[in-house]
């Protein structure tokens, strides 16, 4: 006995699709051997027609897939554009496709259903309209008008025009007759539902004169269409449910056991605690359609959902609703990177971003996520020299380490910056990850002075006290602009005396610069990293005035302004810019958003995803190589 | 909910037919799959067939033992499953029961449905 196992028998019809799901032992030798569906020729044999090694046949190109589900033990063969040539005998099997691995199914594929006499076939989907046209002739304008449904021998009456409405219908038909000159009246049936499906009769007057004519309705239930996408990958669902439920609260919800379509997400403020961060529902178009984003895909993810519309904001019968099975694959392109990182007040944090490494010249973007309403992430900072005004100086995204990862540092952080982060490009929609910044107690490791003031033409020197945990780290000053944080010159002054328990391996590194100029005025960084992997930072706001006294400044600890957590930019004074992630192909409808709240007003709550990836101690944030 | 209906069993001889039927009602417009598995005395549920559907298209497994001889099939219109058996065996004794599901990932697995039936007993002499 063969241990594949599968649906022995398949029936379709022309033009739809298949999907085949062949279940194997999930040993480590049966998840990675080559997976294969042949057609069983008259003569023995079995023709492959596609393969999980590439192999497409000629008669499959452009209409079959096959993929591989090892962590589930199965591997599904899609099949589009049936036609009746395709019916026959086929095998779904594991290695070479005469070893006996292997299961028998029969697809038998027929024609679509014909017409019948005098009778019109209306195919609506579920939850959809359907308008029933009744002709008549002259002799019956002024008599009753009636539909009738064919309920086993019988007609039940559905409605007529003296005011009948049938309690299975109430609230959402109506029989339309049409003005003197058209010799038509017309059924309309809202919300429609799969029992709402079968023979309909149409009459105009009672007698043996009457005119009749006969419908039959299919309420087709959507097929889902079946997604693949990696884990900690992304998912886009568009939805396109008609202009008619335009005003419609929508949702996407997600089948769970039984009858029961748990919200994922609806226009009327409901989100699912485990989509916290990682979801967004993009403002709908006149049309009625929208699309939903989730991020940071876990295996948990995979199942069934369903996009619909109803005052609810859930699954009614009659909602019309599109499906969609989402398959999680955890042999992922996208490296695994923390959920979770955790920053000291007044310290920073270095957040490293995958991207597809075959568009490293795509433009890298960091926003963060926002719950309100249907949630939106208003970007902070791009790889093109833009940072949000109140990020000015704290905030960088670095294209290093490269080859697939950038980097995204943000210091001089507060409660206020607890929250979901997403790191995104302008290439490809699937690598969006989510990051979530928590904010713990704790001492910045780094100690530098609050601002300081420079002298016009005199030397300034800022020191940087690193502690000697950083002893093997590579320490540097730079400053900070738009594009990056420009590398300077700085000068090791030897062990520091900042730090209490700490031996010669602490080091002081001063910043020193000459002959100060305006240009010198502006944010400077100081801090430790490895190679090509960035650490803590902490900065420092450098003014500059007129000569009052001669002589350089040389800054110590104890000239410090305030304590680095009770800094807060006074964004006031001048205009917030927004740039809001509508784009880059996050929703392509609309690039732009201009938003003149103040993003920094307000504080965020920090909200546990329940991450297994937490990553401690805000000085070790580039430890985790891909 | 979704309630479930079976009937149909009873008593025949070796060789013989029966066809038991399944009807579901309730809120069926979200149920995707349905099948049967029967319980013989002391012995745990088995699977016997399963049918699941996506629009006009029918998928339909069977467990090895009832291959060739069990057939089952739908009714859309009706909300029913029937389940054919021919050339019935002793070892075919059993409550059958019907079984419903909105999400299958294995169709033989009991723990993937979501809705069963109270069962019916198909008795099958020497």
């Known amino acids: 006995k063969s241990p594949i196992f599968g649906p022995e028998e398949v029936n379709s019809v022309e033009g739809n699709s298949v999907s085949i799901t062949c279940y194997y032992p999930p040993t480590s030798v049966n998840r990675h051997t080559r997976k294969y569906w042949c057609r069983q020729g008259a003569r023995g044999g079995c023709i492959t027609l596609i393969s999980s090694e590439g192999y497409v046949s000629s008669k499959y190109a452009g209409r079959a897939n096959l993929t591989n589900f090892p962590e589930n033990g199965t591997f599904v063969v899609n099949i589009a554009q049936l036609s009746q040539d395709d019916s026959g005998r086929y095998k779904c099997g594991l290695g070479i496709n005469s070893r006996g691995l292997s299961f028998d199914v029969s697809l038998e594929v027929s024609q679509g259903p014909g017409l019948l006499n005098d009778t019109k076939v209306y195919t609506v989907d579920l939850g959809r309209t359907v308008t029933i046209n009744c002709p008549f002739k002259t002799e019956n304008a002024q008599k009753r008008k009636s539909l009738y449904k064919q309920i086993g021998l019988y007609p039940v009456l559905v409605i007529d025009s003296s005011g009948y409405v049938n309690p299975n219908y109430t609230g959402r038909i109506r029989l339309d007759i049409q003005g003197t000159g058209q010799l038509l009246f017309s059924v309309v049936i809202n919300q429609l539902r799969l029992s709402d499906a079968g023979q309909y009769l149409c009459q105009a007057g009672d007698d043996s004169n009457s005119n009749k004519k006969n419908a039959d309705l299919q309420v087709l239930k959507p097929e889902p269409e079946l997604v693949y996408e990696d884990l900690r990958g992304s998912v886009t669902f568009h939805c396109a449910l008609g202009p008619e439920v335009a005003n419609v609260a929508k949702f996407l919800c997600r089948q769970s056991s039984g009858e029961n379509c748990d919200v994922v997400v609806n226009t009327l403020g409901k989100r699912a605690p485990a989509f916290e961060g990682r979801i967004l529902l993009n403002p709908q178009d006149k049309d009625g359609s929208f699309s939903v984003v989730i991020t940071g895909l876990r295996k948990e993810d995979a199942g069934r959902y369903l996009c619909g519309a109803h005052s609810d904001g859930q699954l009614q019968e009659g909602s019309p609703i599109q499906a969609w099975q989402l398959f999680v694959n955890e042999e992922s392109t996208i490296p695994r990177s923390p959920t979770v990182v955790k920053g000291v007040a007044g310290s920073s944090v270095a957040v490293l971003c995958p991207y597809n490494r075959k568009e490293s010249k795509s433009i890298k973007y960091w926003c963060l996520w926002e719950g309100a309403q249907n949630g939106r992430c208003p970007l902070l900072v791009d790889s093109e020299g833009w940072v949000k005004a109140q990020y000015e100086g704290r905030l960088s995204l670095l294209e290093e380490p490269g080859n697939g990862t950038f980097t995204v540092i943000l210091n001089q952080l507060t409660s206020r910056d607890a929250g979901f982060y997403w790191c995104l490009t302008n290439g490809d929609t699937l690598w969006r990850t989510t990051v979530e910044i928590k904010i713990i107690e704790g001492e910045p490791n780094l100690k530098v002075p609050g601002n300081v003031t420079a002298v016009l033409g005199e030397t300034l020197k800022v020191p940087c006290h690193f502690p000697c945990k950083f002893s093997s780290y590579e320490k540097y000053w730079c400053k900070w602009n738009n594009t990056g944080c420009q590398a300077l010159p700085s000068q090791d002054e030897g062990p520091s005396k900042a730090f209490v328990n700490c031996d010669e391996n602490s080091r002081l590194v001063s910043l020193t610069l000459n002959l100060v100029t305006r240009a010198d005025e502006g944010w400077y960084w100081c801090g430790v990293k490895q190679g090509h992997f960035y650490g803590e930072t902490a900065a420092v706001y450098v003014a500059v005035e007129e000569r009052k006294a001669a002589g350089s400044r040389d800054v110590s600890l104890a000239k410090a302004d305030a304590a680095p957590d009770e800094k807060v930019l006074d964004s006031g004074f001048r205009e917030i810019e927004n740039k809001a992630i509508q784009d880059p192909r996050l929703f392509a409808e609309e690039k732009a958003v201009a938003d003149t709240r103040d993003q920094a007003d307000g504080s965020r709550a920090s909200v546990d995803s329940g991450s297994s990836e937490e990553q401690g101690g805000s000085s070790r944030h580039h430890h985790h190589h891909h | 909910q979704v309630q479930l209906v079976e009937s149909g069993g009873g008593l025949v001889q070796a060789g013989d037919s029966l066809r038991l039927s399944c009807a579901a009602s309730?809120?069926?417009?979200?149920?995707?799959?349905m099948g049967w598995f029967r319980q013989a005395p002391g012995k745990e549920r088995e699977f016997v067939t399963t049918?699941?559907?996506?629009?006009?298209?029918?998928?339909?497994y069977y467990a090895d033992s009832v291959k060739g001889r069990f057939t089952i099939s739908r009714d859309n219109a009706k909300n029913t499953v029937y389940l054919q058996m021919n050339s019935l065996k002793p070892d075919d004794t059993a409550v059958y029961y019907c079984?419903?599901?909105?999400?299958?990932?294995?169709?033989?697995?009991?723990?993937?449905?979501?809705?069963w039936g109270q069962g019916t007993q198909v008795t099958v002499s020497s």
């Open positions: 079984a419903a599901s909105t999400v299958l990932r294995d169709p033989r697995v009991p723990t993937e449905y979501d809705y």
């Open positions: 049918i699941t559907w996506s629009g006009s298209t029918n998928y339909k």
């Open positions: 309730g809120r069926t417009f979200t149920t995707y799959g």
